[in-house]
Amino acid sequence: QNCSGPCRCPAEQAPRCPAGVSLVLDGCGCCRVCAKQLGELCTERDPCDPHKGLFCDFGSPANRKIGVCTAKDGAPCIFGGTVYRSGESFQSSCKYQCTCLDGAVGCMPLCSMDVRLPSPDCPFPRRVKLPGKCCEEWVCDEPKDQTVVGPALAAYRLEDTFGPDPTMIRANCLVQTTEWSACSKTCGMGISTRVTNDNASCRLEKQSRLCMVRPCEADLEENIKKGKKCIRTPKISKPIKFELSGCTSVKTYRAKFCGVCTDGRCCTPHRTTTLPVEFKCPDGEVMKKNMMFIKTCACHYNCPGDNDIFESLYYRKMYGDMA
């Protein structure tokens, strides 16, 4: 992890890197390694891809152990096969306005994510896609016997699936915070990012947090009850410690993770919160990292790799996270 010890490289000559990933000398000048890519975790030994203008952002001067590969100021973004300049805004579809900032794309919904609570006039509120309309709209399913134009007497439990409005006005600054992106890993420790100008200078900045949708070692399919197709949020029996590049969380956590389905759906975080986690490293150094904690998960067909890149990301976004 650090360069104080002697050089020790794997027996095989050089690793085979995936297409588009550079083979570089590690940060200690010892071994050839596959360079870490945008948004991946990096260390002194695991450098970021210099050919893509990436550097290891450790977040704070105190923490020099583990960082996130970040694009240098002004780096462009590649989104849906198109290159955008840093600072450039574009519409990825009729639903989203996106901004490229130093290699990271943050998108704001153009469609209202407004909630509708049941009322006598609309006991069964639903958001539906209407022909010829880009944004989903609220419709109220009427009870069979309702013919009047006034209210209907029925009750209905609407799941609170729509998160808070991410925009607000503050002292000459339209505060805009994009949703947290989906976790970069479907299992194990990954990174989730967002773009915000919620700061004193009202300048766009990137924020990142660690995330773990589920542990890689868990065989969750075994726990699916007979006749069921999904296990949305499996019960975690014992508190766990998180591991991050050889460092271990100081506290133990009874964290929730998302389950799996056997019918092609994927289960992803639905409501989350962000909390700081302290990690202690073998050399005694302690570092603090923000981490996503899952409150609830949702199982759906909008899985990674669907046609609209952002659509699949967006429907897997983290609702209701104000941190």
Epitope: P118, S119, D121, C122, W138, V148, V149, P151, A155, R157
Partner: antibody
């Protein structure tokens, strides 16, 4: 962003008619109903009337003969008229969106005095 | 005339749990009354917290929950925070009209 804003006279003379307008944005009056509620100084909230998304109306029976609620969906406005005003009608008048009374206007204070 | 009654005031310590209730003078409150809970913090506008008995608005923290309890509508706050100090009103629907309760002034000690 959902907003509701009440407007109307600050001072009304007894026996006169009060006309209040609620101008909404961020949602359509064809999708959500709008309620009028008032709060006399130091007292509790009092529900007055509602115009539902499809144009139906309901009123507080205690005021039914004095109240009329209407809307202009294209202008995103809901209008409440209250006839024969009396000093006891002095209050802050609010409009609120239907569906859990989730969004409210800031209110407009109306004083009834000669 | 239908009357909706709330506790005039309640006091709770930070981190504690408190239940505000909303009683109807004409019988048990049911889901057809679409119980709503509205909050007003000092110097701020009203905003809805709960609609349709138990549905939270997007800004309503999970520590707030709406339910029916012993024939009354109830708003339970678990793990009360100092910022929960406010006036809380319930509103019940009676086929043709809503009736608001008198409001509960919730004080958070400390």
């Amino acid at each position: 962003e959902v907003t509701l804003k009440e407007s109307g006279p600050v001072l009304v003379k007894p026996t006169e008619t009060l006309t209040l307008t609620c101008t909404v944005s961020g949602f359509s009056l064809s999708t959500f109903g709008v309620h009028w509620i008032r709060q006399p100084p130091g007292k509790a909230l009092e529900w007055l009337a509602v115009i539902w998304r499809r144009g139906g109306t309901d009123y507080n029976a205690a005021f039914m003969s004095r109240l009329t609620i209407s809307k202009d969906t294209s202008k995103s406005q809901v209008v409440l008229t209250m006839t024969n005003m009396d000093p006891v009608d002095t209050a802050t008048y609010y409009c609120a969106r239907d569906g859990g009374f989730d969004y409210w206007g800031q209110g407009t204070t109306v004083t009834v005095s000669s | 005339e239908t009357v909706v009654t709330q506790e005039p005031s309640l006091t709770v310590s930070p981190g504690g749990t408190v239940t505000l209730t909303c009683r109807s003078s004409i019988g048990a409150v049911t889901t057809s009354n679409y119980a709503n809970w509205v909050q007003q913090k000092p110097g701020q506008a009203f905003r809805g917290l709960i609609g349709g008995t138990s549905n939270r608005a997007p800004w309503t923290p999970a520590r707030f929950s709406g339910s029916l309890l012993g024939g009354k509508a109830a708003l339970t706050l678990s793990g009360v925070q100092p910022e929960d100090e406010a006036e809380y009103y319930c509103a019940l629907w009676y086929s043709t009209h809503y009736v608001f309760g008198g409001g509960t002034k919730l004080t958070v000690l400390g």
